[in-house]
């Protein structure tokens, strides 16, 4: 692809809706940051369309995105992370639409991982723990987590708990006995950075004990 449109193509392009959204991930690969953008309309013909970011960069004026299927992507150490950058959709040298964005306000954290649930018989509760790569990061360290759980048979009846730590205790009496539960967790920047929810962690499944008939307690 040359990246340049014929005149007719350019006229057609101006009729299309090139609305796009982006998210940044800081220190996603060592000290490298990433920026991912995509068109809001999945049917946009992206042939010859390029994304470019200019401003608030270190040592360079502008950077071009790489195209990966339907998304546009940059991984670099060159984001200043101070002030606004201009992100443009371009065909050749012509900008079709641009947005001014501070990359620290569109941060999407990495998904939490190592989610697990341990039943404590003596305490009659379940201890939920998970891990996040953000504990080791310089920038996006403070996150709010959203733990969601449901009885497996209740398709859309999720219970959500927001917390800032990576440990949560669920009381046994708040859960149904002898039931299979699904639990998952996601994160969002909470202080100093703004942005979006991460992807959900992989789900973890656990079963609650049965009720002990003599005492009315769960086994």
């Amino acid at each position: 692809e040359s990246g340049y449109a014929q005149n007719g193509d350019l006229e057609d392009a101006e009729l299309d809706d090139y609305s796009f959204s982006c998210y940044s991930q800081l220190e996603v690969n060592g000290s490298q940051h990433s920026l991912t953008c995509a068109f809001e309309d999945p049917d946009v013909n992206t042939t010859n369309l390029e994304f470019e970011i200019c401003g608030a960069l270190v040592e360079v004026k502008c950077l071009n995105f790489r195209k990966l299927q339907e998304i546009y992507f940059i991984e670099t150490k060159k984001f200043l992370l101070i002030g606004k950058s201009n992100i443009c959709v371009k065909v050749g040298e012509k900008s079709l639409t641009c947005k001014k964005i501070d990359l620290t306000t569109i941060v999407k954290p990495e998904a939490p991982f190592d989610l697990s649930v341990i039943y404590r018989e003596g305490a009659n509760d379940f201890v939920v723990t998970f891990n996040t790569s953000h504990l080791q990061k310089k920038y996006v360290k403070v996150l709010m987590h959203d733990v969601a759980y449901r009885q497996e048979k209740d398709e859309n009846k999720w219970t959500h708990v927001n917390l800032s730590s990576t440990k949560l205790t669920l009381l046994q009496r708040k859960l149904q006995p002898a039931a299979m539960y699904e639990i998952k967790v996601r994160s969002i920047p909470d202080h100093y950075f703004k942005g979006f929810w991460s992807e959900w962690s992989p789900s973890y499944y656990f079963r609650t004990p049965e009720i002990n008939n003599s005492s009315g307690e769960m086994d």
Epitope: A56, K100, T104, Y139
Partner: nanobody, 118 residues
Framework: EVQLVESGGGLVQAGGSLRLSCESS????????MGWFRQAPGKGREFLAA????????HYSDSVQGRFTISRDNAKNTVYLQMNSLKSEDTGRYYC???????????WGQGTQVTVSS
């Protein structure tokens, strides 16, 4: 109409410290990047330090790294420059700037004079 006002400059001996303040009346202060610059006599304006909207990200020129610290208080619409181990070559007029938008600072103060005597 005055939007950025610097204060805290003065005469100080080499090795001493000063803290500059810059108060903003711009409504978007809490979402704007802020920066400090200086202009030595007969020279161009030199970038010193910048800070992101929340204070989480800072950036310094090599000439002041380790000696100067930029900080901000969004509740007071104020940005600060703590200057330690001052040298005679730090003499100049110090300016604050607001809203770093695609490599251009949109607003500038009038500056405050700093003189370091040896």
């Amino acid at each position: 109409e005055v939007q950025l006002v610097e204060s805290g400059g003065g005469l100080v001996q080499a090795g001493g410290s000063l803290r500059l303040s810059c108060e903003s009346s711009i409504s978007t202060f809490s979402s704007d990047a802020m920066g400090w610059f200086r202009q030595a006599p007969g020279k161009g304006r030199e970038f010193l330090a910048a800070i992101g909207w929340s204070g989480a990200v800072t950036h310094y020129s090599d000439s002041v790294q380790g000696r100067f610290t930029i900080s901000r208080d969004n509740a007071k619409n104020t940005v600060y420059l703590q200057m330690n181990s001052l040298k005679s070559e730090d003499t100049g007029r110090y300016y604050c700037a607001e809203d770093y938008d695609t490599d251009v600072w949109q607003y500038w103060g009038q500056g405050t004079q700093v003189t370091v005597s040896s």
